[in-house]
């Protein structure tokens, strides 16, 4: 007896697709050895048809799959447009062989049933309407018109032209006839339920003079889609129901042992395990619409309906539209953090992974907002300019070639506690959703700007020092100033670098950045931060005001007068005269380190290690797909 | 209230045939998967037999100790299933459960584990005699 095992017989109809599990041991080597699909020949060779190992014969070209769920002990061959060429003796199993373990599986494929010349078939989805033509002659014009369901050798009345409808049909079957026909007449059934399938009789007159008509009715259950998902990748459901349902409220619903469990609806329902990485979007009037979730877990497996009904709730005889939803653990997609914590005042730095094939697309963040449907409205991205209410306080760090960027918010609030999604517009399934949560600060901040009050007058120089606590003391320390289109690093000094890391001296580790001489467009935020690599930290911003010199008033910045009195050795004081032709050095003259520092050109460049842009210029903002 | 009775039991000879029956009632139960276990005394419930369905494409799935002699079958509207019982051994002795799911359970899921299954009839003896 075979330790495989499957189904023995499979019957489809023709045009219908099929999804065969095959179950095997649960050992190391099962999980990874080769599996198979092969059909079995007169001769005893079985042919193989799909392999684990990429091999697709032509007759499957385009239309199977063969799918290892290790985790389950299990694989899926999924076949799609069956033909009755596709009947016949099917083996199922492991090894390098088809001689191997195996599985016998009969697969038998008909054509769609026909039935006696005067049966017509209707075949009709769950909750659809269908509409029964029935034909007489034109003795029976003004004669009883009726339509029977047959149980057994009984026929009973569902609905006659005396305006009796059986309680089991009643406000879903109507009996009508079209403008001046005088010999047909119509039953429509509308909401179909799984017990509508059967043979119907309907009838013009009494007697052996009457006119007879068989319908059969097929009523299906809709067969469901296979999705095959990564772990934490995400999924779309594409719902479409029709225009009859246009103006209902849709919902997506998971079923389970008794119900279907609503997911999420239009009606502001929203099931709390999906809480931040779930949208529903409506696609166009005529009730199409999608629902993207994000993040898959493993639990998130199963079995999913989409339909509509006025209480977004799921209704029998309603339409609907299934899917099976598989997560494969065995992911591509890298497991980064799920929830990040800060606190008030301070900043996180989100790492975002994306498809490092596809380095070059473009990078978005937005802030998933839990109104009814859910929505994700960008808040920064590669080329979308940063969101009102984020200024000076967001930036995306993209480092091409990584598979990863790098979101810094500061400045944080509570407000800033929700859930955000890292997303491109490349491969979709690259979603990730973060959770962010900010707490009350209770301490001061690791990362403190000096002056606070940040006021550079047009002209003169302006130094503005940022202080870090020993522990980043290793860590490179950087200013850059913000603009829409990212935070651009610029040459800064670090103070603290000279001390040995033996003695680190709380109170004067201080990277400075100067501006000489300040110009008007020097205004706005600038940041300061630590990092390690392509590895971001802690950043603090602070905003620079620029001003009109007053009459009268000294050349030398007030806070650097006080910076340098109280910080700088006195033979060090006579190195303003040899600033300005130190600065040419520099790659913008009016950036450059905290004088101290600069010995020769070649300490400089050291020192200025300044990364490039954080994003790219303009455009328009972009939006999730 | 959905409920599952099994008929058909009873005693048969050694070599014999029997065709046991379980229908599925409740308003709106409409099965997916139905499926026979069997129990002998002091025995774990064995797999026997199941048959899934979706659309127009049913699976058949048969206990490895029965391939050959058994069959399952199901009726057009899907709510009754039959277990045809040929060539008969002693040690086909057992209680005969009817299981049902309601839901379409994830295809990789084994039938031949009876956690998996949701509803339960409360079974039809069958006794072989030599």
């Known amino acids: 007896q075979s330790p495989i095992f499957g189904p023995q017989d499979v019957s489809s109809i023709e045009g219908n697709s099929v999804s065969i599990t095959c179950y095997y041991p649960d050992t190391s080597v099962n999980r990874h050895t080769r599996k198979y699909w092969c059909r079995q020949g007169a001769n005893g060779y079985c042919a193989t048809l799909i392999s684990s190992n990429g091999y697709l014969s032509k007759e499957y070209s385009g239309r199977a799959s063969l799918i290892n769920f290790p985790e389950n002990s299990t694989f899926v061959i999924n076949i799609a447009h069956l033909t009755q060429e596709d009947t016949g003796s099917y083996k199922c199993g492991l090894g390098t062989t088809n001689r191997g373990l195996f599985f016998d599986v009969s697969l038998e494929v008909s054509q769609v049933p026909e039935f006696p010349n005067d049966t017509h078939v209707y075949t009709k989805d769950i909750g659809r309407t269908v509409t029964i033509e029935c034909r007489f002659k034109e003795g029976n014009a003004h004669s009883k018109k009726s339509l029977c369901k047959k149980r057994g050798e009984a026929c009973e009345v569902v609905i006659d032209s005396t305006e009796y409808v059986d309680p089991s049909y009643k406000d879903r079957a109507i009996l009508f006839m079209k403008g001046t026909s005088r010999d047909i007449f119509y039953v429509n059934i509308s909401h179909l339920i799984p017990s509508d399938a059967g043979l119907y009789v309907c009838q013009a007159g009494e007697g052996p003079s009457a006119d007879k008509n068989n319908a059969d009715l097929q009523v299906l259950e809709p067969e469901p889609e296979l999705l095959y998902k990564d772990l934490r990748s995400s999924v779309t459901f594409e719902c479409d129901l029709g225009r009859e349902v246009a103006n209902d409220a849709k919902y997506l619903c998971r079923k389970n042992k008794e119900t279907c469990d609503v997911i999420i609806n239009t009606l502001g329902k929203r099931d709390p395990a999906f809480e931040g990485r779930i949208l529903l979007t409506p696609r166009d009037d005529n009730g199409r619409f999608s629902v993207l979730i994000t993040g898959l877990r493993k639990e998130d497996a199963g079995h999913y309906q989409c339909g509509a009904h006025s209480s977004g709730l799921p209704q029998e005889g309603w339409p609907v539209q299934a899917w099976q939803l598989f997560v494969n653990e065995e992911s591509t997609i890298p497991n980064s953090r799920s929830v990040v914590k800060g606190v008030t005042g301070g900043s996180v730095a989100i790492v975002c992974p994306y498809n490092p094939k596809e380095s070059s697309s473009l990078k978005y963040w937005c802030h998933w907002e839990a109104d009814e449907n859910g929505r994700c409205p960008v808040l920064v991205g590669t080329q979308a300019l940063v969101q009102e209410g984020y200024e000076g306080r967001l930036a995306l760090f993209d480092q091409p070639g990584s598979g990863a960027y790098t979101v810094i918010l500061n400045q944080l609030t509570t407000q800033d506690s929700g859930f955000y999604w890292c997303l491109t517009d490349g491969d979709s399934r690259w979603r990730t959703t973060i959770e962010l949560q900010v707490a009350e600060a209770t301490k001061k901040p690791d990362l403190e700007v000096t002056p606070q009050n940040a006021t550079a007058v047009i002209g003169e120089t302006f130094t503005i020092s940022c202080h870090y606590p020993c522990k980043f003391y290793s860590q490179e320390k950087y200013w850059c100033k913000w603009s829409n289109d990212g935070c651009h690093i610029l040459p800064s000094h670090d103070e603290g670098a000279r001390q040995s890391s033996v003695s680190c001296d709380q109170s004067s580790q201080i990277v400075s950045m100067t501006l000489n001489p300040v110009k008007k467009e020097d205004e706005g935020w600038y940041w300061c931060g630590v990092k390690e690599g392509q590895v971001y930290g802690e950043t603090t911003a602070i905003y620079v005001a620029v001003e009109e010199r007053t009459r009268g008033s000294p050349h030398i910045n007030p806070t650097d007068a006080n910076a340098r009195a109280k910080d700088a050795p006195e033979e060090e004081a006579m190195e303003s005269s040899v600033r300005e032709d130190e600065n040419k050095a520099n790659l913008d003259p009016r950036l450059f380190a905290d004088e101290r520092e600069i010995q020769n050109a070649g300490d400089q460049a050291q020192e200025n290690r300044a990364s490039g842009n954080a994003g790219s210029a303009g455009g328009q903002s972009g939006s999730s797909k | 209230e959905v409920q599952l009775v099994e008929s058909g039991g009873g005693l048969v000879q050694t070599g014999g045939s029997l065709r046991l029956s379980c229908a599925a009632s409740g308003r709106t139960f409409s099965p997916y998967a139905m499926g026979w276990f069997r129990q002998a005394p002091g025995k774990e419930r064995e797999f026997v037999a199941a048959i899934r369905w979706s659309g127009a494409t049913t699976y058949k799935y048969v206990g490895g100790s029965v391939q050959g002699r058994f069959t399952i079958s199901r009726d057009a509207a899907g709510n009754t299933v039959y277990l045809q019982m040929n060539s008969v051994k002693p040690e086909d002795t057992a209680v005969y459960y009817c299981?049902?799911?309601?839901?379409?359970?994830?295809?990789?899921?084994?039938?031949?584990?009876?956690?998996?299954?949701?509803?339960w009839g409360k079974g039809t003896q069958v006794t072989v005699s030599s």
């Open positions: 299981a049902a799911d309601r839901v379409p359970k994830d295809i990789s899921i084994d039938p031949r584990n009876p956690k998996d299954w949701d509803y």
